[in-house]
């Protein structure tokens, strides 16, 4: 009989007015021995599931069902999965801010809506939260000595338009 | 040396109330979860209250639930059991023991620590 | 609730004897069992848990068995300072102790 709970293993639990090392009962744990208690094991339950199993020696690890995500250090909650038009924040799901769009259903973040102009392209069709903007095709600027190259669809040839 | 002992008890008339005390000694009564435990005279061992380590669950028998309230001071090392509209049938030895099941539980409890007992008589 | 029985209800024995008492659990109980010992005056002591895990400090002629709903104390070789009340205990659901086995000498 030992006279310390010093010498006890995590997965068991010690009490000093008894000091003997003690197997943690079922669905309880101790990663520290010679505590006086071993705690409660995590159980993922409702919209957690597991994903690490309770032992002795360490809690059980949930992570959330399908169409969920885990909110909080150690996955405390499950929240919905964000819908396109949102992005997962520390504080949960937030609408996309003006000018920003996530597409994806439950991941992704949002992302700045594309710049035409850069691409010197119009605006076909306004962005929105969940959807990009739709450029067009290229600004045509007329400015004095442009070529404009056209080759019909039919043949090799091309016609060279002058504009003045 | 490591110790519970139990105080308070004596003679009290039927619907009074009374107030016990167990004083842990020696080691952290604050560690474990705390029941009150009572022997009838010549009659067998119930269980009658428990107080989880810090205090933030309690269970009672049926028969004592509404009537009795168990706590706990840990800055006091101290347990207690407030008896209230006693009965005759209340009348027993009562004893502060420590659940030794080691889990932080509720209800799966056997008690390897036992104070020596105050007896409670309740009469006219 | 789970009703315990314990038989015999008294005992008597000799010095030496191996000496078996008995519990029985209305419910499956697994082995969620406790034994004690009171002595005359005094309080109880836990002797057994987990029904056949020894407590510290008590003498290995005192062991436990069984599992479920039947289960045995044995004192493999009786000693004087043995006399006793002996009492069992499930936890497995709620807490309810039988009602004593008296140990005796004859």
């Known amino acids: 009989v030992q006279n310390s709970c010093d010498n006890c293993q995590p997965g068991t639990f010690c009490r000093k007015y008894n000091p003997v090392c003690k197997s943690c009962p079922p669905s309880t744990f101790s990663s520290i021995g010679g505590q006086p208690n071993c705690n409660i094991c995590r159980v993922c339950a409702g919209y957690f599931r597991f994903k690490k199993f309770c032992s002795s020696t360490h809690n059980a690890e949930c992570e959330c069902i399908e169409g969920f995500h885990c909110l909080g250090p150690q996955c405390t909650r499950c929240e919905k999965d964000c819908r396109p038009g949102q992005e997962l924040t520390k504080q949960g799901c937030k609408t996309c801010s003006l000018g920003t769009f996530n597409d994806q259903n439950g991941t992704g973040v949002c992302r700045p809506w594309t710049n035409c102009s850069l691409d010197g392209r119009s605006v076909l069709k306004t962005g929105t939260t969940e959807k990009d903007v739709v450029c067009g095709p290229p600004v045509v600027s007329f400015s004095p000595s442009t070529t404009i190259s056209v080759t019909p669809e039919g043949g090799p040839g091309g016609h060279s338009l002058q504009v003045l | 040396e490591m110790q519970l002992v139990e105080s308070g008890g004596g003679l009290v008339q039927p619907g009074r109330s009374m107030k016990l005390s167990c004083a842990g000694s020696?080691?952290?009564?604050?560690?474990?979860?705390v029941a009150w435990v009572r022997q009838a005279p010549k009659k067998g061992l119930e269980w009658v209250a428990y107080?989880?380590?810090?205090?933030?669950?309690?269970y009672y028998r049926e028969s004592v639930k509404g009537r009795f309230t168990i706590s706990r001071d840990n800055a006091k090392s101290t347990l207690y059991l407030q008896m209230d509209s006693l009965r005759s049938e209340d009348t027993a030895t009562y004893y502060c023991?420590?659940?030794?099941?080691?889990?932080?539980?509720?209800?799966?409890?056997?008690?390897?620590?036992w104070g020596p007992g105050t007896m409670v008589t309740v009469s006219s | 609730d789970i009703q315990m029985t314990q038989s015999p209800s008294l005992l008597s024995a000799s010095v030496g004897d191996r000496v078996t008492l008995n519990c029985r659990t209305s419910?499956?109980?697994?082995?969620?069992l406790a034994w004690y010992q009171q002595k005359l005056g005094e309080a109880p002591k836990l002797l057994i848990y987990?029904?056949?895990s020894l407590q510290a400090g008590i003498p290995s002629r005192f062991s436990g068995s069984g599992s479920g709903t039947d289960f045995t104390l044995t004192i493999s070789s009786l000693q004087p300072e043995d006399v006793a009340t002996y009492f069992c205990?499930?936890?497995?659901?709620?807490?309810?102790f039988g009602a004593g086995t008296n140990l005796e000498l004859k």
């Open positions: 987990n029904a056949n």
């Open positions: 020696g080691f952290t009564l604050s560690d474990y979860g």
């Open positions: 023991t420590i659940d030794g099941y080691g889990g932080y539980s509720g209800s799966h409890w056997y008690f390897d620590f």
């Open positions: 205990q499930q936890y497995y659901s709620g807490n309810t």
């Open positions: 419910q499956n109980v697994y082995k969620n």
């Open positions: 107080i989880s380590y810090a205090g933030g669950t309690t």
